[in-house]
């Protein structure tokens, strides 16, 4: 979690002198409660913004949004706390809205926004806003909060954020499959504009069911430049395991601006429509484990056989 | 391919405790949060909470606060899911899931069935 | 609590029809709405979140109108895979709270 670093954020606005400032997210009124507090804010809303840095980069960000209750309690608020949590990481930042003068009410309702929280793709946070001074310990509570998922990069307006960007968004590989005689698999997916390895993870389950009857790994070598963006074809070899018929294909591509950690693409192929009764399958343990680089799979010829070329 | 495997079928009597496995393939556990789900019989869908591997920080429904604990271990990439002092209401099928807001994949589910 | 509404609770179409699911939030919840189809026997998958977004392998059939408290599933050519019970959730605040689901069946 971070602060965009331009443009300076503002919350003054008509009628309000106002400054932003980096907060530990521990009010000091937590400490020293006062006796009249403002109530909660109203209508708090969290949007997916896009904002540029001074460098150009493109990173989403979160558009916080809320209104002010219209009720004699504004005579009390001296400020705003506003708080993104990470939820899987449990990692917080905090900015404060600190009011250098007195609000009144107006003719219209005081409403403040915020843009400047910088969030990653594919993540969850909750965001939540504290008025000012923050309540004795039994007061009500004067805070609202929103939780707010960050869309991952298959949509189409991160796609073109930096951190999309650096993982591999641009690559569309248009991953074709299909199913030839003598159980085998050909895939056919578009090479991206530079010279790094894929890796092909095949992994087969049974008609109806999630956990694989077969898995298998195959390595593709970085192509030349003159194979830029060319079809490249594999055939895979698939065990011969009755009713083992829906097969999922998966891309991982290793980009210098990602190594490890691309972002993978995906075709499955469906079971015949009228499947025959499967036999019992072995329990199979998956031996690979997505986003990372290392395999502990075995030689090719233990798993099934494949060989492939690029086509110009 | 993320999976997610359920430890199997219990009965328990009332009063008693279960304990609930989850194990985790295809990523690395710590990256999302784990979220667990319960269906009764025949019924709708109930959120219970869910737990960060990463940090280990839980968030349990009012409903089931005290009364259930998540956990998880690492090192096998294993959540669990704990809950006490079982009633005949809470005869149902429980499932781990994935994420902690939008829950995108989910265990095969575990049925506890609470009988004396 | 929010609390979720679905409707209907069963809904009767025909293959390669339009089915159109419905699901009511109690107070706003802007855009933070999934939708899951759970088949008999089978844990539930996420098809859309974020109220529009299709999640990863789901085909473009699957959509979602709405925000704030009014949301439409739309199937927009029912396949023979897409009959199942269908349930809506709201991920706007805490607790996670679903809509008690709707039943497509065969007409």
């Known amino acids: 979690l971070r602060l965009l670093d331009f443009p300076a954020p503002v919350c003054a606005q008509e009628g309000l002198s106002c400054r932003v400032k980096n907060s530990t997210c521990l009010d000091d009124s937590w400490i020293h409660p006062r006796n009249l507090t403002p109530s909660s804010p109203k209508d708090l809303q969290i949007q997916l913004h896009f904002a540029h840095t001074q460098q150009g980069d493109l990173f989403p960000v979160a558009h916080i949004e809320w209104t002010l209750q219209t009720d004699a309690s504004i005579l009390y608020l001296e400020g705003a706390e506003l708080s993104v949590l990470q939820l899987n990481t449990n990692e917080r930042l905090c900015v404060r809205f600190e009011f250098l003068s007195k609000l009144r009410h107006h003719h219209r309702r005081w409403r403040f926004t915020f843009s400047h929280f910088v969030v990653d793709p594919d993540q969850e946070y909750e965001v939540t806003v504290h008025h000012l001074p923050k309540p004795i310990p039994d007061g009500d509570p004067n805070h609202q909060s929103k939780n707010f998922l960050v869309p991952d990069c298959e949509h189409a307006r991160m796609k073109v954020t930096t951190p999309c960007m650096s993982s591999g968004s641009l690559w569309d590989p248009n991953i074709t499959v299909e199913t030839l005689e003598a159980h085998q698999l050909r895939v056919s997916f578009t090479l991206w504009n530079e010279s790094t390895h894929y890796q092909i993870l095949l992994t087969s389950f049974p008609h109806m069911e999630n956990h694989s009857c077969f898995e298998h790994m195959h390595h593709i070598p970085a192509p030349r430049p003159e194979e830029f963006h060319q079809r490249s074809n594999v055939t895979l070899t698939l065990r011969n395991l009755k009713g083992c018929c829906r097969h999922q294909v998966q891309i991982q591509p290793f980009f210098s601006s990602c190594l490890n950690d691309c972002l993978r693409h995906s075709a499955t192929v469906s079971c015949p429509e009228m499947p025959d009764t499967p036999e019992p399958i072995p329990d199979y343990m998956p031996l690979w484990e997505p986003r990372s680089g290392s395999s502990d799979y075995k030689d090719d010829d233990d798993k099934g056989s494949s060989h492939h070329h690029h086509h110009h | 391919q993320v999976q997610l495997v359920q430890s199997g079928a219990e009965v328990k009597k009332p009063g008693a405790s279960v304990k609930v496995s989850c194990k985790a393939s295809?990523?690395?556990?710590?990256?999302?949060?784990i979220s667990w789900v319960r269906q009764a019989p025949g019924q709708g869908l109930e959120w219970m909470g869910w737990i960060s591997a990463y940090s280990g920080n839980t968030k349990y429904a009012q409903k089931f606060q005290g009364r259930v604990t998540m956990t998880t271990d690492t090192s096998t990439s294993t959540a669990y899911m704990e809950l006490r002092s079982l009633r005949s209401d809470d005869t149902a099928v429980y499932y781990c899931a994935r994420r902690q807001l939008a829950l995108d994949y989910w265990g095969q589910g575990t049925l506890v069935t609470v009988s004396s | 609590e929010i609390v979720m509404t679905q409707s209907p609770a069963t809904l009767s179409v025909s293959p390669g029809e339009r089915a159109t699911l419905s699901c009511r939030a109690s107070q706003s919840i802007s855009s933070n709405l999934a939708w899951y189809q759970q088949k008999p026997g089978q844990a539930p998958r996420l098809l859309i979140y974020g109220a529009s977004t299709r999640a990863t392998g789901i085909p473009a059939r699957f959509s979602d109108n709405g925000s704030g408290t009014e949301f439409t599933l739309t199937i927009s050519s029912l396949q023979s895979e897409d009959f199942a019970v269908y349930f809506c959730q709201q991920y706007d605040t805490w607790p996670l709270t679903f809509g008690g689901g709707t039943k497509v069946e065969i007409k």
């Open positions: 295809g990523y690395t556990l710590t990256s999302y949060g």
